[in-house]
């Protein structure tokens, strides 16, 4: 039976031609994370795995950083970067967890950051 | 160098049973996932079991489940195959194949050969 | 179990040829798709992983692209030992599939 939940920072903005951390927590479940997927809508930004570390998708690796921990760092964010990011956490034995963050990024200087986890 | 060595394979009767092994070398074996992968005559790809590096949790085909289990030892770098109820349609080539983060086989074996016939 | 459907199922070009494979999954598979080459008697060799990454060591001629449903292998200049059977493959979920193959021969 799964019990976990997935906590994010939900809905972020950001300002192009800054930087974004993408955060998730696997909270309430005692089940191993072997290894964590970031997409960006139908796209595979990077891999975090247990045993084997990260793996950056090569067209992303200008742009993307590994962490802070399972996050992911998007740099010189651009309005293209406007959309879904998924977080999606491979467990044993409990399986699949995903979580969805929606990040705008904004022209002006008003991007406001999600309640939970802020970057300062 | 990655290397991946298939043996094990060979002619069979219907309804009995062999074991493949891969020995693998050049890489952390334990901190890979691994399938076999196999080829009938003239046909094309088809995946045949898988094994978690972390967890050695298993996974089959249809075609396959409740006949092959799939299993690991780490401490021989050595990934199996024991193959039950052979059939006719099991004839085919087996590879091995590691795959990275659970996404790509980025190598394979050169195969071993198991032929079900009476 | 999801399917995958490549075509054409063989084709006949030249050296120097611009080659387009198509493989189309039977439902989303974001970017999970893996694209093998094969000569007879050989193992497969991965080309490009994850839609449009290639894989280290493969000549830059080789591309993949699309996500979701739809996805292409280009060979931008056919070379002689390019000639082979090629396979799309999924891995969003298990079972993994492959497509049927699609054989590149000299015309």
């Known amino acids: 039976m799964m019990t976990g939940t997935i906590e994010t920072t939900g809905n972020i903005s950001a300002e192009k031609g800054g930087s974004i951390i993408l955060q998730c927590h696997l909270s309430s479940t005692t089940a191993q994370v072997t290894q964590v997927n970031w997409e960006q809508q139908d796209q595979l930004l990077a891999i975090c795995n247990a045993d084997l570390g990260w793996h950056i998708s090569p067209s992303f690796k200008d742009r993307v950083a590994p962490g802070p921990g399972l996050g992911l760092t998007l740099q010189s964010l651009t309005v293209n970067d406007t959309g879904e990011y998924f977080c999606i956490y491979h467990t044993y034995p409990d399986g699949t967890y995903t979580g969805r963050i929606f990040l705008e990024v904004l022209e002006s200087s008003v991007a406001e950051h999600g309640a939970r986890f802020q970057i300062p | 160098e990655v290397q991946l060595l298939e043996s094990g394979g060979g002619l069979v009767q219907p309804g009995g049973s062999l074991r493949l092994s891969c020995a693998a070398s050049?890489?952390?074996?334990?901190?890979?996932?691994m399938s076999w992968v196999r080829q009938a005559p003239g046909k094309g790809l088809e995946w045949v079991a898988a094994?978690?590096?972390?967890?050695?949790?298993?996974y089959y085909a249809d075609s396959v489940k409740g006949r092959f289990t799939i299993s690991r030892d780490n401490s021989k770098n050595t990934l199996y195959l024991q193959m039950n109820s052979l059939r006719a349609e099991d004839t085919a080539v087996y590879y091995c194949?590691?795959?990275?983060?659970?996404?790509?086989?980025?190598?394979w074996g050169q195969g071993t050969l198991v032929t079900v016939s009476s | 179990d999801i399917q995958m459907t490549q075509s054409p199922s063989s084709l006949s070009a030249s050296v120097g040829d611009r080659v387009t494979i198509t493989c189309r999954a039977s439902?989303?598979?974001?970017?999970?798709l893996n694209w093998y080459q094969q000569k007879p008697g050989k193992a497969p060799k991965l080309l490009i992983y994850?839609?449009?990454s290639l894989q280290s060591g493969v000549p830059s001629r080789f591309s993949g692209s699309g996500s979701g449903t739809d996805f292409t292998l280009t060979i931008s200049s056919l070379q002689p030992e390019d000639f082979a059977t090629y396979y799309c493959?999924?891995?969003?979920?298990?079972?993994?599939?492959f497509g049927g193959g699609t054989k590149v021969e000299i015309k």
């Open positions: 994850a839609a449009s």
């Open positions: 493959q999924q891995s969003y979920s298990t079972p993994l599939t």
């Open positions: 439902q989303s598979i974001s970017s999970y």
């Open positions: 050049g890489f952390t074996f334990s901190s890979y996932s």
């Open positions: 194949a590691r795959e990275p983060y659970d996404v790509w086989l980025d190598y």
């Open positions: 094994i978690k590096g972390s967890t050695s949790s298993s």
